[in-house]
Interface confidence: medium
């Protein structure tokens, strides 16, 4: 048993043009969090199993709001390690998927919205009990820098955490500095001591007394960066202190190949030899396959049978994004009829209907006149979610309850005089005019 530990150092726009300034905006503050998924090495069944070695979720990072015009700072990250406990043996070779998620804290109805910003994947060899390994991964325009290690939980020891070492109750026959080990009483376990002076940051050992270097470092104690270790470089001026030629700026300096790719110079530029699972000019494209289950929300993964070919997610209705991780703004499809107000609650869609309409999508036109009587012989007229009364002569108002003065509107043209009558109105026309309203 033991724990895999992952430390995220930075997440932000990668180098080069077209990189985004920030995953958040001034209008929409957000915060980041991470999810890691581990699968055992290269076994075939590992592809189907989700995070069979374990998985972990980081805390939320601090809320970040982009300041327009200000230089893009490092994005605030969640505190602490991501820890993935494992119960059985550490497999030595493992696959990982690290996802960076954005939580938008705007004014969405129904709470925050989530979207997948970046997903990186890789296969690595790692012995338990070794030092922190460092990595840089690129996903699209984003760059993720992190370190990881596997450590055994007592009493487990060894590179796979399979041997048990526990102190005996009986006096130890082991020499000073050695621990008695189960299951054999006479077996003594020496704490792993690397070669004296071996760099604790850039070197490690799997056998006592050795000093093996992490990528990018060399020398007997792993203290020399690879780019300055060679005196064979034909470029650049001579260094007075070492007598070596100080390398000038070569195309492979600083190793432009990401994700453990190795750089070799070509007559015009450089060439990256990418490890399995990565491709692109600088090995920056991560080879997530359909087996890693990259499509969310029931999206169908097509292609991507091996890490050298890309995958495409065909999203079900209501979802979009390269991984079907974004919910379509379903209100933009205007599902509410008859002028209803659409509310996307996240887990459901609601329509708030105008008066006179009902149903999940406001599709039912209620009988506006039901139970509505118009007084004094008026008739009810439906329309627009409200009822209206067409009143008999001499009556007015919403329900025809008010007596109306038929002459109030001056209906008699050309100076005719109006007289109210029980059957309506009568116009007495001025000389030279005629008609019911003196219109002729």
């Amino acid at each position: 048993a033991g724990v895999f530990e992952l430390q995220i150092h930075s997440f932000g726009p990668g180098p080069g043009p077209g990189a985004p300034r920030s995953p958040c905006s001034a209008r929409l503050p957000c915060r980041l969090f991470f999810r890691v998924c581990l699968k055992p090495g290269l076994s075939e069944e590992a592809a189907e199993s989700p995070c069979a070695l374990g998985a972990a979720l980081s805390a939320r990072g601090p809320v970040y709001t982009e300041q327009p015009g200000a230089p893009a700072p490092d994005l605030p990250l969640p505190d602490g390690l991501l820890q993935v406990p494992f119960r059985d043996a550490w497999p030595g070779t493992f696959s990982f998927i690290i996802e960076t998620w954005r939580e938008e804290l705007g004014d969405q109805i129904g709470g925050p919205a989530w979207s997948l910003l970046a997903r990186v994947a890789g296969r690595r060899r790692l012995a338990a009990g070794g030092p922190w390994a460092r990595d840089i991964q690129r996903a699209g325009a984003w760059e993720l820098r992190f370190s990881y290690r596997a450590r055994c939980e007592p009493p487990a020891v060894g590179t796979a955490c399979t041997r048990l070492c526990r102190p005996r109750s009986a006096p130890s026959r082991c020499g000073p500095g050695l621990r008695p080990c189960a299951p054999l009483e006479d077996e003594c376990e020496a704490p792993l001591v690397c070669r004296a002076g071996c760099s604790p940051e850039h070197g490690f050992c799997e056998q006592p007394g050795e000093c093996r270097c992490l990528e990018g470092w060399t020398g007997p104690l792993c203290t020399v960066p690879v780019s300055t270790s060679s005196c064979l470089s034909p470029r650049g001026p001579s260094s007075a202190t070492t007598g070596c030629l100080v390398p000038g700026p070569g195309p492979c300096d600083g190793n432009p190949c990401a994700n453990g790719g190795s750089c070799s110079e070509t007559p015009r530029s450089f060439e990256c030899t990418c490890p399995r699972g990565f491709y692109g000019l600088r090995c920056e494209v991560s080879g997530v396959t359909c087996a890693d289950g990259p499509c969310f929300n029931g999206g169908l993964c097509v292609g991507g049978a091996d890490p050298d070919s890309a995958y495409i997610c065909h999203c079900p209705p209501g979802f979009q994004g390269s991984n079907c991780e974004k919910r379509v703004d379903r209100c933009s499809l205007q599902p509410c009829r008859n002028g209803g107000l659409c509310l996307d609650l996240g887990h459901a869609l609601r329509c708030r209907c105008r008066a006179g309409f009902a149903g999940p999508r406001c599709e039912h036109d209620l009988d506006d006149c039901a139970g509505r009587a118009c007084a004094n012989g008026g008739t009810c007229v439906e329309g627009g979610g409200a009822h209206r009364c067409s009143c008999a002569l001499g009556f007015g108002g919403r329900d025809c309850r008010e007596r109306a003065d038929p002459c109030a509107a001056r209906p008699c043209a050309h100076g005719g005089r109006c007289y109210a009558h029980f059957s309506g109105l009568v116009c007495a026309c001025a000389p030279g005019y005629m008609g019911a309203r003196c219109e002729f």
């Epitope: 969090f33 999810r35 998924c37 199993s49 989700p50 995070c51 069979a52 374990g54 998985a55 972990a56 979720l57 998620w101 939580e103 709470g111 925050p112 919205a113 989530w114 289950g293 969310f296 929300n297 029931g298 079900p316 209501g318 979802f319 991780e325 919910r327 996240g346 887990h347 459901a348 869609l349």
Partner: nanobody
Framework: EVQLAESGGGLVQAGGSLRLSCTAS????????MGWFRQAPGKEREGISC????????YTADSVKGRFTISRDNAKNTLYLQMNSLKPEDTAMYYC???????????????????WGQGTQVTVSS
């Protein structure tokens, strides 16, 4: 192997209570959104409750709101559904399910869920 195993179903009288459990093996529910669904004979499978991994938020369908409560114990890798004031119309096969997306979105659609249990029968007699 990935497995979700439901338990706790059975026969109960109307007004009674049951607590369903769903234990996961082969993966960690802490990083999965977990939901409870049910399917009555001759009817479509309907979502009744969900707990998201991102917000720790829970959603409950209107038909069971105030009576059913979803919860999870990540340390035990188990999802629960506490069902109170049961009614005969709650009779159905109950399933738990898991999906990688952090939110309980999608109109309770079962299509977004990747892993399913075999189900446990709940029968409420009047």
């Amino acid at each position: 192997e990935v497995q979700l195993a439901e338990s706790g179903g059975g026969l109960v009288q109307a007004g009674g209570s049951l607590r369903l459990s769903c234990t996961a093996s082969g993966f960690t529910i802490a990083v999965y959104t977990m939901g409870w669904f049910r399917q009555a004979p001759g009817k479509e499978r309907e979502g009744i409750s969900c707990t998201s991994w991102a917000g720790g938020r829970t959603y409950t369908a209107d038909s069971v709101k105030g009576r059913f409560t979803i919860s999870r114990d990540n340390a035990k890798n188990t999802l629960y559904l506490q069902m109170n004031s049961l009614k005969p119309e709650d009779t159905a096969m109950y399933y738990c399910a898991a999906k990688a997306h952090p939110d309980c979105s999608g109109d309770w659609s079962p299509s977004g869920y990747e892993y399913w249990g075999q189900g446990t029968q709940v029968t409420v007699s009047s």
